[in-house]
Amino acid sequence: WSSKVLMSSANEDIKADLILTSTAPEHLSAPTLPLPEVQCFVFNIEYMNCTWNSSSEPQATNLTLHYRYKVSDNNTFQECSHYLFSKEITSGCQIQKEDIQLYQTFVVQLQDPQKPQRRAVQKLNLQNLVIPRAPENLTLSNLSESQLELRWKSRHIKERCLQYLVQYRSNRDRSWTELIVNHEPRFSLPSVDELKRYTFRVRSRYNPICGSSQQWSKWSQPVHWGSHTVEENPSLFALEA
């Protein structure tokens, strides 16, 4: 048994997943409506949000989330104690710092309490799902007449666990120059033109020593250095999102 649906979207598999049943050997369980996927992110190792698309449910359903770690003294699932809501329907769970174990396999179960057989269990490596806060306290200093050093700080996460993406450009540049800085929250620009005005910004990710997160933080607040007397072209200087 299987269901078919005609779709003309490049993402037809993903969209269809919400309305198709499984194709399985005959002796397997009867078809049930698939549950939405759960997506979890650990925010700066301060808390974790696990969310799902509650609007994909054909009727408003308060799905429940239970979780556990693969290796733990108490191997039973515990229910979310802090649900997130969207239009008064559960759409996520916030898990606090003391319940986060980055280096244990995280097992999360989404269930329809009205149809207990409707359940989906996912496994996640949380160390690959960390999103740091945006770097803060960006400061610029002159190392020499034409050499600049940029420093910044990251809260709550060891510096060696982070990789940084630095972007800078002058008021004369159409695009950003960018480079990766590993583990050390500083970067030096060997040659700057004092007649130009420079803008710097930084973001970070939890990679590659302590985890393999592909998700970058938000950009830091930009900092500026250089001549205020140069007439700037606003269209070139506007910060990109």
Epitope: D13, I14, A16, D17, L20, T21, S22, T23, A24, L28, S29, T32, P34, L35, E37, V38, Q39, C40, V107, Q109, Q117, R118, R119, A120, V121, Q122, K123, L124, N125, N128, L129, Q214
Partner: nanobody, 126 residues
Framework: EVQLVESGGGLVQAGGSLRLSCAAS????????MGWFRQAPGKEREYVAI???????FYADSVEGRFTFSRDNAKNEVYLQMNSLQPEDTAVYYC????????????????????WGQGTQVTVSS
């Protein structure tokens, strides 16, 4: 529609090895969560190895260190290398796939998979 076809099963002595293959047609597996499941006579179906398209792989405790999941997106195939096989590994092995939006999704619940192969028998004699 995705069709999954398993191969590589057979009869092997305890301590031996087998490599199961699962070939997909109809759609690329590059954004699919994939899993290998098994069902022994009179027992419930259980997951053996599951994989997210972002590369996170998880194994059942009973096979950890002996079985290895891999995928070849260019060939549109996934594999299960089974070493140090034991009689209790005897079962029909199924390959399953689920399209996913997120690179980190790996399902251990069988009802989360939309597409299934017909299975390949693995028998381990003592």
């Amino acid at each position: 529609e995705v069709q999954l076809v398993e191969s590589g099963g057979g009869l092997v002595q305890a301590g031996g090895s087998l490599r199961l293959s699962c070939a997909a047609s109809g759609r690329t597996l590059s954004r699919y969560a994939m899993g290998w499941f098994r069902q022994a006579p009179g027992k419930e179906r259980e997951y053996v190895a599951i994989d997210s398209w972002g590369g996170d792989t998880f194994y059942a405790d009973s096979v950890e260190g002996r079985f290895t999941f891999s995928r070849d997106n260019a060939k549109n195939e996934v594999y299960l290398q089974m070493n140090s096989l034991q009689p209790e590994d005897t079962a029909v092995y199924y390959c399953a796939g689920a399209p996913t939006s997120f690179a980190t999704t790996a399902y251990s619940s069988s009802n989360s998979y939309r597409y299934w192969g017909q299975g390949t028998q693995v028998t381990v004699s003592s």
